[in-house]
Structures are given as structure tokens and as C-alpha cells.
Interface confidence: medium
């Protein structure tokens, strides 16, 4: 059975994953961000459910895009450091997800723009912490 | 006295394009972002995107991806938004208005053209 | 993308009366980065309040804003007959820029 101190440091590792994920996208999802246009025209893989840790499998699938797509935002109004920040999301999603089990991610039909993916992981966590909580 | 002057009505067959200039003065052109926001007759206001005069960088409205080109000609002091293959439902008034630019990043529109009618029909 | 509610979507007043308009959004608003406008039939809109409480340059002291988060008012203290009009409210902190579904008020 997990114990508080587990679920706190799974809480605080949702939470960074959280600011992580908000940071990202308020860096994007900015009007005069001139690189947005081009950005939404990338599309990302949704999973067909998520509402547990193991779903973050879906996640660390598309972290690769993801840095490949804030790499374009680069540009002097956009500090966001894309290696780093995905190595980062990725070190909390292991810690998240665990290693124990093997989850093959299932995918939703319809694919979604970096906002919308974005979105969902966003919505995921609080979802997830709010359970915590 | 600033100012955006847009050009007159225009109508439209379904499938064409149609172009709407609007013209600045008072004001250093490329100091200030421009948004185009539409009104289709009796409803509310649609945003469409934002050029920047200064560099030319537009973002669209995910809506009008692919169909909205916004342009700016610095020496008249001219922005562009062109609109493809029309359809009856972009029958509207389209607005040009300035982002003011007095309370940081973002800023609300202080400064409106007057509306240029685009009518679609066949 | 952030959803605007405007309530009522009529409001009949007397000049003189008090004017209390809504402008809910369906997430919060960053920053209060919420303007309202004022539009005629046959003009353009017109800049009242930016930041949620802010008066445009040359806006009457009668019109006020306020709120943060989800939750925004604009207030027209004693209406003059010239405040009949659609009132809309955006925000303008992210993309999509969106604007509420107005508001009119019209003359008792």
C-alpha cells in the first residue's frame, strides 16, 4: 500500500510536471510567439485513455516531437531550453510511471496540435493530484 | 490624429479570395502590433490573427489556418489580410485594430478601422 | 481556447440607472489581461477598460471594471442615453484571442 511519504513525493513530482508542462505551453500558445503558426501544423498522438501513472507511458512516447517542435520556437522572446526541459520531464515521468510493468500506450484515432497535447497532459495531472489531495 | 482607413466593401463569388488593406497614420507604423477581427451581421467578434509591422511575423487563429495571409507594406504604411476560398459564412465585417501598447506584453485594441463589408454570394 | 460568458444578454435600463454587466471565462485569465468594448450599430468597437480596470484614454470616470480570474464586471454607474449600445468583453492573454458573446443595453 503506498504510503504518505510516497504520495507526497508523487504529488510533488505531478506538480513538477505540471509547471513543466504549463511553462511550455505558455511559452507557445502566445500570439506574438511568430513561430506558432508553423508549430500548430505538427501533429501528436493522443492516448485513448489516461487516468493512471502507467498511462505517462504516452507521454514519454511523444517527448521526442515534442523537443523537435520547441526547437522551431526558439528565437529571442522564447527562452525555453528544449533538451533540457524534456530530459527533465522525462527523469520525472519514469519516477512517475515506474519501471515495474510493461504498459503498451494505445492511441486515440485523431492526433492533436502541440496545444491540444499539451492540454491534455496538463488536465491529466491535475486530474491525478487532485486524487492526492 | 491616429488613424486606420480600410478599404470599401467588396463581394464575392464562393471559392474566390478576397484582399483588405488597412491604412495607418498618426502613429509609427511599426511601434504597434495589428489584429483583424471579424463580425458576421447581428453576431459577436472573431479574432483572426496579428501581424507584426515592424518584422512581418503573423500568427492565425487556428480557425483560418491556411486560408488567412496577413501582410504589411512599411512604406505606405499598409497592412494586408487576404482570405481564400470563400464561403457564405465569411460574409462579414473585417476590422483592423491596433494593439496599444501602454501596459506591457499583451495589450487590449485601442485604436479600430472602420470596417470593410465582404459579402460571399453566388 | 478560452470561452467568454456575457450575461444578461439584454439589459433594459433608464438613463440614470445603474449598469451591471458579466463577463465569466471558462479558465482563468492571466495576469487580468481583460478589456471591454463598446459598439454602436454601424461602428466600430470601441476600448473602454483593458487589464480589467483600467479606463481607455478619454473614457468617462462612469464606467468601471473590475474582477480577476474567471470572474470580471463592468459597471456603468448612471447610464447617459449615448451608453445604449453592445457591450463585449475579451481576453487577451492567450491565443486564441477570444471576445464574450456581448451584452446589449438597450432603453426601458
Known amino acids: 500500500a503506498p504510503t504518505s511519504s510516497s504520495t507526497k513525493k508523487t504529488q510533488l513530482q505531478l506538480e513538477h510536471l505540471l509547471l513543466d508542462l504549463q511553462m511550455i505551453l505558455n511559452g507557445i500558445n502566445n500570439y506574438k510567439n511568430p513561430k506558432l503558426t508553423r508549430m500548430l501544423t505538427f501533429k501528436f498522438y493522443m492516448p485513448k485513455k489516461a487516468t493512471e501513472l502507467k498511462h505517462l507511458q504516452c507521454l514519454e512516447e511523444e517527448l521526442k516531437p515534442l523537443e523537435e517542435v520547441l526547437n522551431l520556437a526558439q528565437s529571442k522572446n522564447f527562452h525555453l531550453r528544449p533538451r533540457d526541459l524534456i530530459s527533465n520531464i522525462n527523469v520525472i515521468v519514469l519516477e512517475l510511471k515506474g519501471s515495474e510493468t510493461t504498459f503498451m500506450c494505445e492511441y486515440a484515432d485523431e492526433t492533436a496540435t502541440i496545444v491540444e497535447f499539451l492540454n491534455r497532459w496538463i488536465t491529466f495531472c491535475q486530474s491525478i493530484i487532485s486524487t492526492l489531495t | 490624429e491616429v488613424q486606420l482607413l480600410e478599404s470599401g466593401a467588396e463581394v464575392k463569388k464562393p471559392g474566390a479570395s478576397v484582399k483588405v488593406s488597412c491604412k495607418a497614420s498618426?502613429?509609427?507604423?511599426?511601434?504597434?502590433?495589428m489584429h483583424w477581427v471579424r463580425q458576421a451581421p447581428g453576431q459577436g467578434l472573431e479574432w483572426m490573427g496579428i501581424?507584426?509591422?515592424?518584422?512581418?511575423?503573423?500568427s492565425y487563429a487556428q480557425k483560418f489556418q491556411g486560408r488567412v495571409t496577413m501582410t504589411r507594406d512599411t512604406s505606405t504604411s499598409t497592412v494586408y489580410m487576404e482570405l481564400s476560398s470563400l464561403r457564405s459564412e465569411d460574409t462579414a465585417v473585417y476590422y483592423c485594430?491596433?494593439?496599444?501598447?501602454?501596459?506591457?506584453?499583451?495589450?487590449?485594441?485601442?485604436?479600430w478601422g472602420q470596417g470593410t463589408m465582404v459579402t460571399v454570394s453566388s | 481556447e478560452i470561452v467568454l460568458t456575457q450575461s444578461p444578454g439584454t439589459l433594459s435600463l433608464s438613463p440614470g440607472e445603474r449598469a451591471t454587466l458579466s463577463c465569466r471565462a471558462s479558465?482563468?485569465?492571466?495576469?487580468?489581461?481583460l478589456a471591454w468594448y463598446q459598439q454602436k450599430p454601424g461602428q466600430a468597437p470601441r476600448l473602454l477598460i483593458y487589464g480589467a480596470s483600467n479606463r481607455a484614454t478619454g473614457i468617462p470616470d462612469r464606467f468601471s471594471g473590475s474582477g480577476s480570474g474567471a470572474d470580471f464586471t463592468l459597471t456603468i454607474s448612471r447610464l447617459e442615453p449615448e451608453d445604449f449600445a453592445v457591450y463585449y468583453c475579451?481576453?487577451?492573454?492567450?491565443?486564441?484571442?477570444?471576445f464574450g458573446g456581448g451584452t446589449k443595453v438597450e432603453i426601458k
Open positions: 501581424i507584426n509591422p515592424s518584422g512581418g511575423s503573423t
Open positions: 479558465q482563468s485569465v492571466s495576469s487580468s489581461y
Open positions: 498618426g502613429y509609427t507604423f511599426t511601434s504597434y502590433y
Open positions: 485594430a491596433r494593439e496599444g501598447n501602454s501596459s506591457g506584453y499583451y495589450n487590449a485594441f485601442d485604436i
Open positions: 475579451q481576453q487577451y492573454g492567450s491565443s486564441p484571442l477570444t
